[in-house]
């Protein structure tokens, strides 16, 4: 069974100190939520006990193997069913506390009750406040069965239940009518998939007689022992105050565990803790009596004296459960209670014997549990004790269960029951999930779901080249964290496995399923500059850059324009898919920006070393357009363009810039500075004769301005080829300026 | 579905017995009281036993020492073993099941007539 | 023994009228221990109220219950054809579970 108590401090005078605490012995419990350990969880379950809404409840964890529930503000916030779930895959397990309110109307005799399939399970709920109403039973808040008022025996209401069944189990309360359901008796009964004595999926698997009150598992076959007992049959007690599978807590507090109840998992349900029981588990146990809730009797013989904690304590000579076995019988020795081997591995298995006459070798035998002996192989006989050493067989799954070492002499004989766990060697299920990759490594999460039995002990990761027959590379690496692999080679399909190993010798699984990890691209070393860059408009950046030139191909597939605008805080990023371009034109611009410009070489997802920046401010945005622009044909070679000034400027024009193009070419277009702001036409000469040409224009004052609309026109015909356009003012002719 | 379905009735002579059944299906009737209640020709209803889960039984006073009340669980039936009767126990009776907490008479079987006449 | 008393003994209304009736204990009796029955000639009794004022599974919401102590009320809002029937009143706090002597809601 699973490691797992829920601690209830029932010191009720003031609900403020009341606490819940869940406490794991599992490896790995409650580490997180990664596929080693699940986290404890601890908390309240008003499916069933509604209780009214108040402050939440406060969760504290402390480590990775207790968690605590406080914060109850008044008595209603403890009536109900608490749950603590703990362990992992299949072992997780549910530990459910039942609190009743010691000012309830009835209250239960015995809150748990751990029955066998087909017994009669007798749940009493003794009258503390007597009302003449009915009594309501009702079954995981279901209503179930009703009792007169009249029907009370002893002050008791009893509810019988002949040939219960597993589905009977559950969380039963009595109420009387009309009465807050916060007065209720609530009660846990907890049925065993078996009869008395029984355990398995067809109940044939005969139990290995749980002392001390500890209960058989109907699953498996373990005891589930009582606080403070510890053992495979829960024959060794621990020492006082101590609790958990291998004695391995402590009681908190100076008075040990008093007022503490323990729940442990099903079918054991809650009791006291050793020596002590009541209501509040207050009480200490009557002379004569022991263990959890002082259920059991110490009948010590020999001079045996009872202690409340473990039971009778033998003079010298005697020993057993009651001092009834003298010394001169044959003993077996510090037997572990439980051992654990990795399947089909061939362990030895010591058992050590003392005695009088001695034990020799052949008088102490190992049986498994399919009834098969084992022969000692060899003893080492000490003063004190004669140890045999078995060779067990290779082991299959069919060997986990109650093996027994026996000794046999004169005197008598001795026998001790241990059980034998074989594991599973574990199999991840899924291939590793790649992280991150790089040009010459993986990062890999080696966290995979597996088959077979935990905890893992180590994760080796095997790889190697895909579609390679050379040997794989292993790394070992700690279960919960993230492995690199380094020092391979770029662009390059990896086929990656992993091999989960578990404690004990044999205990490396079967390698994961492979999956195919590439790296990535191998960096651009390459570190351009930036040539020049000139404004093409307020909000146009014409940039050049160059290469160095190395040898051998260009690593690389583009290049990354970024503009960094620092007043607002923003970049600009350009992409340019092309690695032989070296120019490009970075427009929507904000005008009158700072920007600090640099480019680098990208090569799949990598980016190369940054150019040494640049820093270039745009002109300010310009004036608004000039209004109806219109063109005249003049001659063959001049054509005459007039417009009106922009409205609303914001000051002086320092100039108009025209642009000329012919219609459906498909060269650049040619600017013309008309560098006298005042005029309103201009004349545009040294055009072809029969030419459609297209024009538009704008203004500058600290920086170029809206264009204007555009306009066409043609030269007359019959003239011949001119050099090319060139602008006249009504003022003066001016040249070409371009 | 819930289905009572009561027997048993008839024509008997003042001082003479009957045994009423009601066969119960479609619930758990182990775990719910059950009741006889009886209505005379063009009266009211008049409620005459119960029984519950655990066996306890109550009666009211005009059948009081007559009539029996028992139940099988075994076979989900009700029972009420009518002694002495009385032409005053002329009527239509009704078997029914309790709602639950035994707050109402939920379902209630189609009746069977007895007759106490000479 | 607690007696329970309904009225009117008969009520005459039409289709889609609202009908109230009204039963009285002679002495308090809890309201969880209060129901309501409906029976039509030839048939068996039918729950429609318990707990005064909880409509039994399948009861249209038409039929509402309300009152504690000694005076206890049954409202039709909206009379249905099939509404047309005997109304019967329980209690179920004392022995004997006494019922009322009837409420006749017939057609106007």
């Known amino acids: 069974a699973v490691d797992l108590t829920l601690l209830a401090n029932l010191r009720l005078t003031d609900p403020q100190r009341f606490f819940l605490t869940c406490v794991s012995g599992e490896a790995g419990a409650g580490r997180g939520s990664d596929a080693w350990g699940p986290p404890l969880l601890l908390e309240k379950d008003d499916r069933i006990v509604r209780t009214p809404p108040g402050p939440p409840l406060r969760l504290a964890r402390n480590g990775s193997h207790q968690v605590t529930l406080r914060g109850f503000s008044k008595p209603s916030d403890l009536v109900g069913v608490f749950s603590c779930v703990g362990g992992a895959g299949a072992r997780r397990t549910r530990v459910i506390y039942v609190h009743n309110s010691p000012g309830a109307h009835l209250l239960p005799d015995k809150v748990t009750h751990t029955v066998n399939k087909g017994d009669t399970a007798v749940l009493s709920a003794r009258v503390h406040k007597e009302k003449q109403t009915d009594v309501i039973w009702k079954s995981n808040g279901s209503y179930f069965y009703t009792l007169d008022w009249h029907e009370a025996q002893d002050g008791r209401f009893l509810l019988q239940l002949p040939n219960v069944q597993p589905p009977s189990s559950g969380i039963y309360s009595a109420t009387y009518l009309e009465a807050s359901p916060l007065g209720s008796a609530f009660f846990r009964l907890i049925v065993r998939g078996c009869g008395a004595g029984r355990w398995g999926p067809g109940c044939t698997k005969e139990c290995p007689g749980c002392l001390h009150g500890g209960v058989c598992h109907d699953h498996d076959g373990e005891c589930v022992c009582p606080p403070g007992f510890t053992g495979t049959r829960c024959e060794q007690a621990c020492r006082e105050g101590r609790f958990g599978q291998s004695c391995q807590e402590q009681c908190p507090g100076i008075s040990g565990c008093r007022g503490l109840t323990f729940c442990l998992p099903d079918p054991y349900g809650c009791s006291c803790g050793s020596g002590w029981r009541g209501s509040q588990c207050q009480e200490a146990c009557a002379p004569g009596h022991f263990g959890a809730d002082c259920r059991l009797q110490c009948q010590c013989q020999n001079g045996g004296t009872c202690d409340r904690f473990s039971g009778c304590v033998c003079p010298s000579g005697w020993h057993g459960v009651h001092c009834e076995k003298s010394d001169r019988i044959p003993q077996i020795l510090n037997m572990a209670s439980e051992l654990e081997f990795n399947l089909e591995t061939m362990p030895r298995i010591n058992c050590a014997a003392a005695g009088n006459p001695f034990p020799v070798r052949g008088s102490i035998e190992l049986r498994k549990p399919d009834g098969t002996v084992l022969l000692s192989t060899k003893a080492i006989v000490e003063p004190e004790k004669t140890t045999a050493e078995f060779e067990v067989p290779r082991l299959v799954l069919a060997d986990s269960g109650f093996w027994e070492c026996r000794v046999s002499t004169s005197g008598g004989q001795d026998s001790r029951r241990f059980k034998v766990n074989v594991k599973v060697p574990p199999v991840p299920l899924a291939a590793p999930r790649l992280l991150t990759k790089q040009s010459r490594q993986l990062v890999v999460s080696p966290l995979v779901s597996f088959s077979g039995d935990g905890p893992i002990s180590t994760v080796r990761l095997h790889y190697r080249p895909q579609d390679s027959t050379m040997d794989w590379s292993t790394i070992v690496v700690d279960p919960s964290e993230n492995v690199t692999l380094m020092n391979l080679r770029p662009k390059t399909g990896y086929s990656v496995r992993v091999q989960l190993s578990r404690p004990g010798e044999g205990g490396e699984g079967a390698w994961g399923p492979p999956t195919l990890m590439t790296t990535d691209c191998p960096e651009p070393l390459l570190q351009p500059w930036l040539e020049g860059w000139h404004v093409e408009g307020t909000d146009r950046l014409r940039v050049s850059w160059s290469l160095p030139l190395v040898p051998g191909p260009l690593v690389g597939d583009g290049f990354l324009l970024r503009l960094w605008d620092g007043t607002r805080g923003q970049e600009r990023r350009e992409n340019v898919s092309s690695p032989q371009a070296r120019t490009a034109l970075l427009t929507g611009l904000t005008p009158g920006t700072h920007y600090q410009l640099d480019v680098q070489l990208y090569h799949c997802t990598l980016l190369g070393p940054a150019s040494p920046p640049a820093h270039v401010l745009l002109p300010p945005s310009g004036p608004p357009a000039p209004r109806h622009l219109h063109a005249q044909a003049l001659s063959d070679s001049e054509i005459q363009l007039t417009w009106k000034h922009p409205e609303a400027l914001p000051g002086p024009i320092s100039k108009y810039v025209v642009e000329v193009q012919v219609a459906g070419g498909a060269g650049d277009p040619l600017w013309i500075d008309v560098d006298r702001p005042e005029e309103t036409s201009t004349i545009i000469r040294g055009l072809n004769a029969s030419t459609r040409y297209l024009f538009r224009m704008r203004a500058s004052i600290q920086g170029l301005g809206d264009w204007s609309n555009t306009v066409e026109e043609s030269t007359l015909g019959n003239g011949l080829q001119a050099e090319g356009p060139v602008q006249e003012s009504r003022a003066a002719e001016e040249g070409l300026d371009q | 579905e819930v289905q009572l379905l009561e027997s048993g009735g008839g024509l008997v002579q003042p001082g003479g017995s009957l045994r009423l059944s009601c066969a119960a299906s479609?619930?758990?009737?182990?775990?719910?009281v059950m009741w006889w209640v009886r209505q005379a020709p063009g009266k009211g209803l008049e409620w005459v036993s119960?029984?519950?889960?655990?066996?306890?039984?109550v009666y009211a006073d005009s059948v009081k020492g007559r009539f029996t009340i028992s139940r099988d669980n075994s076979k989900n039936t009700l029972y009420l073993q009518m002694n002495s009767l009385r032409a005053e126990d002329t009527a239509v009776y009704y078997c029914?099941?309790?709602?639950?907490?035994?707050?109402?008479?939920?379902?209630w079987g189609q009746g069977t007539l007895v007759t106490v006449s000479s | 023994d607690i007696q329970m008393t309904q009225s009117p003994g008969t009520l005459s209304l039409s289709p889609g009228e609202r009908a109230t009736l009204s039963c009285r204990a002679s002495?308090?009796?809890?309201?969880?221990?209060l129901a309501w029955y409906q029976q039509k000639p030839g048939q068996a009794p039918r729950l429609l109220i318990y707990?005064?004022?909880s409509r039994a599974t399948g009861i249209p919401d038409r039929f509402s219950g309300s009152g504690s102590g000694t005076d206890f009320t049954l409202t039709i809002s909206r009379l249905e054809p099939e509404d047309f029937a005997v109304y019967y009143c329980?209690?179920?706090?004392?022995?004997?579970?006494?019922f009322g002597q009837g409420t006749k809601v017939e057609i106007k």
């Open positions: 029914a099941k309790d709602l639950g907490g035994t707050r109402a008479f939920d379902y």
């Open positions: 479609g619930f758990t009737f182990s775990h719910y």
């Open positions: 119960g029984i519950y889960p655990s066996g306890w039984t």
């Open positions: 002495q308090s009796v809890s309201s969880s221990y």
């Open positions: 707990g005064a004022s």
């Open positions: 329980q209690q179920r706090g004392n022995w004997p579970r006494t």
